[in-house]
């Protein structure tokens, strides 16, 4: 959950607890299980290059 | 250019404890995750858990919750398992890895292994 | 837990000769946004395992493309076109759709 006070994260992008900060939903794509991914399932990723493991 | 070494090889008796370090460098360490994979001897890679080192966050397999301790020091760019309650079946080589979760991302990277070796 | 399960167990083989390893994993792997998250790594004697192929069929950084994955959900498999002697070790597939990540149990590929 986003901690309070900080600014909601901008278009394209989702909140990460695991990392504390807002998260491209592109980075789906490399990682899908990632904890703000279930944020991003509404919202169309920005565009991406190159996906590793 | 990115590189993770680990601590150097320990033997230990049964029943002790053991800490193994991680440090990296090349890369901002609380950019990436920090895996740790168990491979005993002749046998195949198993998964430990890993680390947010940037919130110290942790994930683990079931196999090993309450065996390993993920833990990270930002101040040093190191990452450390502890292992616990040490049986000979923990005696193997375990790795630390760099784990992504961006898109741009140029590599993937572990460190050299260090070996455990649980004996009395 | 998703199990990946491999074989042959060993592959003897000639340089020059093509070889091939097959990878079976207990639940799809194709992500719903098309991704198939199955990955190849190579562990040479007293190294670390290095990747190969990351996302069913896309070669890492600096792998010769003798190398080549294909395959389905379930099904994946692995191919030199030519082995060289350097390609000796054990290939291990991988997953990354969801944790814990696994690996399947290994082919060791060895020069006849």
């Known amino acids: 959950e986003q901690a309070p006070g900080t600014a909601p994260c901008s278009r394209g992008s989702s909140w990460s607890a695991d990392l504390d900060k807002c998260m491209d939903c592109a980075s789906c794509r490399a990682r899908p299980h990632s904890d703000f991914c279930l944020g991003c399932a509404a919202a169309p990723p920005a565009p991406f290059r190159l996906l590793w493991p | 250019q990115v590189q993770l070494v680990q601590s150097g090889a320990e033997v230990k008796k049964p029943g002790a404890s053991v800490k193994i370090s991680c440090k990296v460098s090349?890369?901002?360490?609380?950019?990436?995750?920090i895996a740790w994979v168990k491979q005993a001897p002749g046998k195949g890679l198993e998964w430990i858990g890993e680390?947010?080192?940037?919130?110290?966050?942790?994930y683990y397999s079931e196999k090993f919750r309450g065996k390993a301790t993920l833990t990270a020091d930002k101040s040093t760019s190191t990452a450390y398992m502890e292992l616990s309650s040490l049986r000979s079946e923990d005696t193997a080589v375990y790795y630390c890895?760099?784990?992504?979760?961006?898109?741009?991302?140029?590599?993937?990277?572990w460190g050299q292994g260090t070996t455990v070796t649980v004996s009395s | 837990d998703i199990v990946m399960t491999q074989s042959p167990l060993s592959l003897p083989v000639t340089p020059g000769e093509p070889a091939s390893i097959s990878c079976r994993s207990s639940?799809?792997?194709?992500?719903?946004?098309?991704?198939?998250?199955l990955y190849w790594y190579l562990q040479k004697p007293g190294q670390s395992p290095q990747l190969l192929i990351y996302?069913?069929?896309n070669l890492a950084s600096g792998v010769p493309d003798r190398f080549s994955s294909s395959g389905s959900g379930t099904d994946f498999t692995l191919k030199i076109s030519r082995v060289e002697a350097e390609d000796v070790g054990v290939y291990y597939c991988?997953?990354?759709?969801?944790?814990?990540?696994?690996f399947g149990g290994g082919t060791k590929v060895e020069i006849k």
């Open positions: 890895a760099r784990r992504t979760i961006y898109y741009d991302y140029d590599g993937d990277y």
């Open positions: 680390i947010y080192p940037g919130t110290g966050r942790t």
């Open positions: 991988a997953h990354n759709l969801e944790l814990p990540w696994t």
């Open positions: 639940k799809s792997l194709l992500h719903s946004n098309g991704i198939t998250y």
């Open positions: 996302q069913m069929s």
């Open positions: 090349g890369y901002t360490f609380t950019d990436f995750i």
